[in-house]
């Protein structure tokens, strides 16, 4: 390093097609007295020394082309008030050239292989001609501050295209380049950047959630799809159609869109793109039940957090099967699904399934002409003890004087399993409690032979994990048949 306060080193290189020589240095301490530069040919005219005056307060100067011979070697030094400013520098005019910027062509080829890649063609600088240059390229997102350098550096004798990999979809990028004489210096300036936009990716997987094939009129369906790049904010265009009717929904956020009634097909495309790609086209036509899978079975998978699903083929072989599942009470857009080839008649659903939580699992056969779904099955990874008991109420006596009671179902999320049986309990004041188990298919009980007095009744429900707590008490008074709730 040079001593503090001493002038910075002198740098010289030829620039541009006219071949002028540009010399620069760090500003001098004494700005009033202009320095003088000298240069001497070392190859062709060793006895000739040229003097170049520098304008005041300027820390650079150009040496006109007529003062030197191309391909010469020059010795250059400088003085101020007759005193030397720097160590003299030797400049090889063959290698110390600062090339012009490379030309980057605006045609950008983008491929969607495993990752999004862009390829750009380029041309070497016009100057210096007939020299092999090494060129370096860099790219960045348009809004980013920092650039990423591309490796390897490219030579002008091969003109390999510039390749950028792992790009994000739907994003603006800039690319620029600079060149240097092979085995020379300095680098040329960076070219002004070429901007280009990567396309949005098509959604990877489109499915329908809800009751698209519901015949009871409660048809509420949602088109859902998987975001190819969850980190990128993208809107989609969704088309629905039936016969000659097509409806378009634009600027749809990821990743759902309500299905209008009676639609027969749906297409999802990113942004305002109009390229309809077959994988995103879904037929919404409901096919005959015999085309649907049958004998769907669900079980907890041994030694794994997943859920096992099996089924049998319907009357014909589909293009594929889709198994979808959702937690009880979840909204339509909370659906998970997986696609399986037609030869697969079982799958292990991936993910963490919580114990005591009911999952609605549906197997659908997908045909070119539409869908055929098997009836949904409610399954559990593990059953737990119920959190609540059923509410009990009184029905009209049958026969008169013989009370009849009924009880409701415990909501699925509180039941936490399948009801194996109910336990009906009755307690008379001052006497012990009598309980009896009744089938899970039964939700009424007749109470014959009750003596006069007051009684408390309650019901519990059991799953395979055990008996739940009692539901609310029903107070019963005989013979006046009045009901009081606790």
């Amino acid at each position: 390093t040079r001593p503090h306060g001493s002038p910075g080193p002198l740098q010289c290189y030829s620039v541009g097609p006219l071949g002028i020589l540009n010399c620069s240095w760090e500003p001098l301490g004494d700005l009033e007295t202009p320095p003088v530069l000298y240069h001497q040919s070392q190859k062709y005219h060793p006895n000739r020394v040229w003097e170049v005056k520098v304008p005041s307060k300027q820390s650079w100067v150009t040496i006109p082309r007529e003062q030197f011979t191309m391909a010469d070697k020059l010795l250059i030094w400088g003085t101020q008030k007759g005193r030397p400013l720097w160590s003299s520098v030797s400049v090889n005019l063959e290698t110390q050239m600062k090339p012009d910027t490379p030309q980057i062509f605006s045609q950008v080829d983008i491929s969607e292989e495993a990752t999004l890649e862009a390829t750009v063609q380029w041309a070497p600088p016009v100057w210096p001609p007939q020299k092999v240059l090494i060129c370096q390229f860099r790219y960045k997102e348009c809004q980013a501050e920092t650039w990423t350098r591309l490796e390897p550096q490219l030579k002008t004798d091969g003109l390999t295209p510039v390749e950028m990999q792992n790009l994000e979809p739907g994003t603006c990028y800039q690319v620029s380049g600079r060149c240097q004489v092979e085995n020379g210096y300095p680098w040329g300036e960076w070219s002004s950047p070429l901007s280009f936009q990567t396309p949005f990716l098509d959604p990877e997987d489109v499915w329908v959630s809800g009751t698209v094939c519901e015949t009871s009129g409660k048809r509420a369906a949602l088109l859902v799809w998987k975001d190819p790049r969850p980190c990128v904010q993208v809107t989609y265009t969704v088309w629905f159609g039936a016969g000659d009717i097509t409806t378009t929904q634009e600027e749809v956020p990821c990743c759902k869109s309500p299905v209008p009634a009676w639609m027969e097909w749906a297409v999802v495309s990113p942004g305002n793109s109009t390229s309809w790609v077959p994988p995103t086209n879904l037929s919404l036509v409901c096919l005959a039940p015999e085309s649907a899978p049958c004998d769907v079975g669900v079980s907890s998978a041994d030694g794994s957090p997943g859920i096992k699903v099996t089924w049998k083929q319907g009357t014909r072989k589909p293009l594929e099967y889709v198994v979808d599942w959702a937690q009880d009470g979840d909204s339509l857009d909370k659906l998970n699904w997986t696609r399986l080839p037609p030869g697969n008649l079982s799958t292990l659903l991936p993910g963490e399934f919580k114990g005591g939580v009911p999952y609605r699992i549906t197997v659908t056969a997908v045909y070119s002409g539409g869908l055929a779904a098997a009836p949904s099955v409610w399954g559990f990874r593990e059953e737990l003890v119920p959190l609540a008991g059923p509410a009990v109420w009184r029905l009209p006596d049958d026969p008169p004087g013989t009370p009849v009671v009924a009880w409701g179902e415990v909501p699925r999320h509180q039941l936490r399993g399948q009801a194996t049986h109910y336990t009906f309990c009755i307690q008379s004041r001052g006497l012990s409690t009598v309980c009896r188990n009744v089938s899970s298919q039964t939700q009424t009980a007749t109470l014959p032979n009750l003596h006069l007095g007051s009684f408390k009744l309650w019901v519990t429900v059991s799953t395979v994990a055990g008996q739940g707590p009692p539901g609310p008490n029903l107070s019963l008074h005989l013979p006046d048949n009045r009901i009081r709730w606790k």
Partner: nanobody, 123 residues
């Protein structure tokens, strides 16, 4: 952990009867079934029952001859086999699982299995 233990197998003449019993302990399962495997053949489902619910399901080959039932007091599931035929000869296995839907006799859903009991029917 579910433990299953079969009993009641043996030899019988065609047309005779046998009663197989499967004792289950420590279970958190909702279906139990009987499966059988004859030498050189695949395992096949015979009958299944939902625990508590009492729903039953039978293979076509045993309908009307076999009856599956549960005894809550003894924690057992029994298979009463009447009108036995030589083709009923096999090793009989009791199985249990947490199973939902219509796959009553699909062995893939039953993850607890007994050791098996041999049934031989001679003509």
């Amino acid at each position: 952990q579910v433990q299953l233990q079969e009993s009641g197998g043996g030899s019988v003449q065609a047309g005779g009867s046998l009663r197989l019993s499967c004792a289950a302990s420590g279970y958190s399962i909702n279906r139990m079934g009987w499966f059988r495997q004859a030498p050189g053949k695949e395992r096949e489902g015979v009958a299944a029952i939902s625990i508590g619910g009492g729903q039953t399901y039978y293979a076509d080959s045993v309908k009307g001859r076999f009856t599956i039932s549960q005894d809550n007091a003894k924690n057992t599931v029994d298979l009463q086999m009447n009108s036995l035929k030589p083709e009923d000869t096999a090793m009989y296995y009791c199985a249990a699982g947490l199973v939902y839907g219509e796959a009553w006799l699909d062995s893939r859903h039953y993850n607890k299995w007994g050791q098996g009991t041999q049934v031989t029917v001679s003509s």
